[in-house]
């Protein structure tokens, strides 16, 4: 029935590899969207939430046209590594209020890891450097309260959703240019 999850088929066609990365990104976007909606239902958000440790969004309205594949893949991989760290932290330190979402957070983490492996493979196929994050990694302390962990979850899922939407846009456009 095909290769096991996380082991992409062997291909020397960068367009096919990129296509596969786009589809995984869209799949993760769907999961993130669903989980964010669940969060809003269970713990209604009072406005927008932010977290200083999250990466800043990689793009503004004007930058799509000038995107280059190496830059998009490198930035996406670095940002997703940060989101992976934040999801792991949420699962570890989120407290009892987020325990009900543990299966979904676990599945989200697995999908994130799978996408990161796919991006790493794509970058190695394209002979791109596996860049390390620019800034030093700031340790994530425990949330100040139960409400703090809920606010953090809203911020993480919201930021990941925007990052993935941006990534799908960029990757789709780049694929048409290959």
């Amino acid at each position: 029935p095909g290769p096991p999850a996380g082991s992409p088929r062997v291909s020397s066609d960068p367009r096919a590899d990129l296509d596969s990365a786009v589809l995984l990104t869209r799949s993760l976007l769907a999961d993130t969207r669903q989980l964010a909606a669940q969060m809003r239902d269970k713990f209604p958000a009072d406005g927008d939430h932010s977290l200083d440790s999250l990466p800043t969004l990689a793009m503004s309205a004007g930058t799509l046209g000038s995107l280059q594949l190496p830059g998009v893949l490198t930035r996406l991989r670095v940002d997703l590594m940060s989101y992976l760290r934040h999801v792991q932290w949420l699962r570890r330190a989120g407290g009892p209020s987020l325990k009900t979402l543990e299966p979904e957070l676990g599945a989200l983490q697995a999908r994130l890891e799978r996408l990161l492996r796919r991006l790493q493979l794509l970058m190695s196929r394209l002979a791109l450097p596996q860049a390390a994050p620019d800034q030093p990694v700031i340790p994530l302390g425990p949330p100040a309260s139960a409400w703090g962990s809920i606010r953090a979850a809203h911020a993480i899922l919201g930021g990941l959703h925007l990052t993935l939407d941006w990534a799908v846009r960029g990757l789709l456009l780049l694929k048409t240019r290959l």
Epitope: D19, L23, L24, R26, S27, L29, A30, R33, L57, M59, S60, A61, G62, T63, L64, L162, D165, W166, V168, R169, L172, L173, K175, T176
Partner: antibody, heavy 119, light 111 residues
Framework: EVQLVQSGAEVKKPGASVKISCKAS????????MDWVKQAPGQRLEWIGD????????IYNQKFTGRATLTVDKSASTAYMELSSLRSEDTAVYYC????????????WGQGTTVTVSS | DIVLTQSPASLALSPGERATLSCRAS??????????IHWYQQKPGQAPRLLIY???NLESGVPARFSGSGSGTDFTLTISSLEEEDFATYYC?????????FGQGTKLEIK
């Protein structure tokens, strides 16, 4: 009730531009992207482009790149599509539709705006 | 671009009959666990209305007599027992890739 309400019909001369608005209500505007679709008489529906209300960053059907411009006004929960250098083939009904890039189907549609290009 | 071909172009049936509409894609639109095909209904002077998403999921508020099936390149919309209000034009749409495209439509008419 989730609704998309579009601006009224337009008649334009060849070479002119038209800007159509689409006002969203009944849902959180930033939670969905806005897509635009063209339906010319006797032709199949044609996707024009998609915009994310939070980050902007529209993507376009290559056929419309350079002539279509998608924008949003977040504070007014309104999306806009401007089409420039109009020609007779642009005579059509234009729809805004609520979408998202994960699965990319359109679950809520505006009522449509008829644009007629005629000299 | 992926081309979607719908058949038949028109179909004349009576209320109570079963309708089977076909949509064929020029390349596979199924991958990563999803079939990226969606079905819409459009009546004259109205906007399209989503019926089925991701090949087989019934949109909220759509009657259960509508169903979708298929994978890869061949998809089907079935209306199990036609009602008067079902006579309209039906479009399939893919979202596998950029740009999403639509089929040319199947017009369902009363016999």
């Amino acid at each position: 009730e989730v609704q998309l309400v579009q601006s009224g019909a337009e008649v334009k001369k060849p070479g002119a531009s038209v800007k159509i608005s689409c006002k969203a209500s009944g849902y959180t505007f930033r939670d969905y992207n806005m897509d635009w679709v063209k339906q010319a008489p006797g032709q199949r529906l044609e996707w024009i482009g998609d915009i994310n209300p939070t980050i902007g960053a529209p993507i376009y059907n290559q056929k419309f790149t350079g002539r279509a411009t998608l924008t949003v006004d977040k504070s007014a929960s309104t999306a806009y599509m401007e089409l420039s250098s109009l020609r007779s083939e642009d005579t059509a009904v234009y729809y805004c539709a609520r979408g998202e890039l994960a699965h990319w189907y359109f679950d809520v549609w505006g009522q449509g705006t008829t644009v007629t290009v005629s000299s | 671009d992926i081309v979607l071909t719908q058949s038949p172009a028109s179909l004349a049936l009576s209320p109570g009959e079963r309708a089977t509409l076909s949509c064929r894609a020029s390349k596979s639109v199924s991958t990563e666990g999803y079939s990226y095909i969606h079905w819409y209904q459009q009546k004259p002077g109205q906007a399209p209305r989503l019926l089925i998403y991701l090949a087989s999921n019934l949109e909220s508020g759509v009657p259960a007599r509508f169903s979708g099936s298929g994978s890869g390149t061949d998809f089907t919309l079935t209306i199990s027992s036609l009602e008067e209000e079902d006579f309209a034009t039906y479009y399939c749409q893919h979202s596998r890739d950029l740009p999403p495209t639509f089929g040319q439509g199947t017009k369902l008419e009363i016999k």
